[in-house]
């Protein structure tokens, strides 16, 4: 914290220019207004101060908005945005999205650090969803930003925003959360053909239950062995051969090479063996012929 | 985004030292530089400055009349050239771009 002293004669800024770089910590604090520093926020950016010099004017400013910044000072802050802590920021009410990428752009580039994080939450928040420009602005800036939220998070995602999402945006989400992704995916697209609609869903189909799997399989749609390879394990175990090699379609030959990997590894227990050699691939520990299969589920579901 | 200062050295008083700093991995023709020092338990203080044009300059009253900034875009550099050097030049000179900090500074040693 630096000591309040007095400003020097013919030292006083009239504005914020490059001249300020030469003041010693003491005489910004002393010559800067906060209030001109508010006002001229937009040219803080173009002057290489130090650090030091940076941390006394963030002072001016927290002295100056004791209650949290305004938006007309938080969208000049540039640079100083980094300067900010989580609890800073907590203060904030951000409502503009342009505030949000003039910030955001200032951390490009970089992981995303707890300042960002507490941004963008407060400006979701304040929103109330997730709406489509500020999926595409945040996911533009961090591709794996839907995959960060927790599936509660994710519910106030609307359908609307889906168009948003590219595939890449979805790699490192996690079952649970393509859980709640899928249904507002399905409802997005729901009025597209059939092709088209299988390219936009198929990011999303790690999420989609057997009965959905069982439709697009009469679409002749030609699911590649990666999507496959993602879909839930018991979404895909009801699946008969025939239905996996309609979805497949020339694909169908990669499960040789996946057979020891979930899901094909535990579907292929669950089916005949006499049904996979249909296949003409040579999978192997299907269930013997003249072997009687009880569903026990279904046996204790009925009693 | 990263500064490298280069061209500190030993130098007696009275004699002429002159600075790069250059930029790697961005332009620097959309920056503003500032040139800064800080001598050992002394606070970092600013020496010049010049703006991204090199239509501006600016100096520490301490060292007006004996430095001098320039920039040279094509060769992504900027440089100071300091004459008459003191003793209380002694310092790590570092430079910066808009944001801080440069990089890892150049020693200077009026002796």
């Known amino acids: 914290e630096v000591e309040k002293t007095a400003c020097p004669s013919g030292k006083k800024a009239r504005e914020i220019d490059e001249s300020l770089i030469f003041y010693k910590k003491w005489e910004l604090e002393a010559c800067v207004d906060a209030a001109l520093l508010a006002t001229q926020m937009d040219r803080v950016n173009a002057i290489p101060f130090t650090y030091e010099q940076l941390d006394v004017l963030k002072h001016k400013l927290d002295e100056l908005y004791p209650q949290g910044y305004p938006e007309s000072v938080i969208q000049h802050l540039g640079y100083l945005f980094l300067k900010m802590s989580p609890e800073d920021i907590r203060k904030w009410n951000v409502t503009s999205l342009e505030t949000l990428k003039a910030l955001l752009e200032v951390n490009k580039g970089h992981e995303m650090s707890p300042q960002v994080a507490t941004l963008i939450d407060r400006f979701v928040k304040g929103r109330g969803q997730l709406d489509k420009d500020t999926l595409d602005t945040l996911t533009a800036f961090y591709p794996g930003y839907l995959c960060s939220l927790s599936p509660e998070e994710l519910s106030s995602v609307p359908p609307s925003s889906i168009w948003a999402v590219r595939p890449q945006d979805l790699d490192t989400c996690d079952p649970r959360q393509l859980d709640v992704l899928y249904p507002k995916a399905r409802l997005a697209f729901q009025n597209m053909n059939g092709s088209e609609y299988f390219v936009k869903i198929q990011s999303f189909l790690g999420g989609a239950p057997t009965e959905d799997l069982k439709a697009l399989s009469q679409q002749n749609v030609s699911m590649d062995l990666a999507t496959f390879m993602k879909l839930r394990t018991d979404a895909v175990l009801p699946l008969t051969v025939a239905e996996v090699q309609k979805l497949l379609g020339p694909h169908v030959e990669g499960l040789k090479a996946e057979e020891r990997h979930r899901p094909v590894r535990d579907w292929i227990l669950r089916q005949r063996q006499d049904d996979l050699d249909t296949l003409g691939l040579g999978l192997q520990g299907g269930i013997p012929n003249g072997y009687l299969v009880l569903d026990l589920s279904m046996q204790e579901a009925l009693s | 985004l990263q500064l490298v200062e280069s061209g500190g050295g030993l130098v007696q008083p009275g004699g002429s030292l002159r600075l790069s700093c250059a930029a790697s991995?961005?332009?620097?023709?959309?920056?503003?530089i500032g040139w800064f020092r800080q001598a050992p338990g002394k606070e970092r203080e600013g020496v010049s400055y010049i703006s991204s044009s090199g239509g501006s300059t600016n100096y520490a009253d301490s060292v007006k009349g004996r430095f001098t900034i320039s920039r040279d875009n094509a060769k992504n550099t900027v440089y100071l050239q300091m004459n008459s050097l003191k003793p209380e030049d002694t310092a790590v000179y570092y430079c910066?771009?808009?944001?801080?900090?440069g990089g890892q500074g150049t020693l200077v040693t009026v002796s």
């Open positions: 991995g961005f332009t620097l023709d959309y920056y503003a």
């Open positions: 910066a771009a808009d944001w801080p900090p």
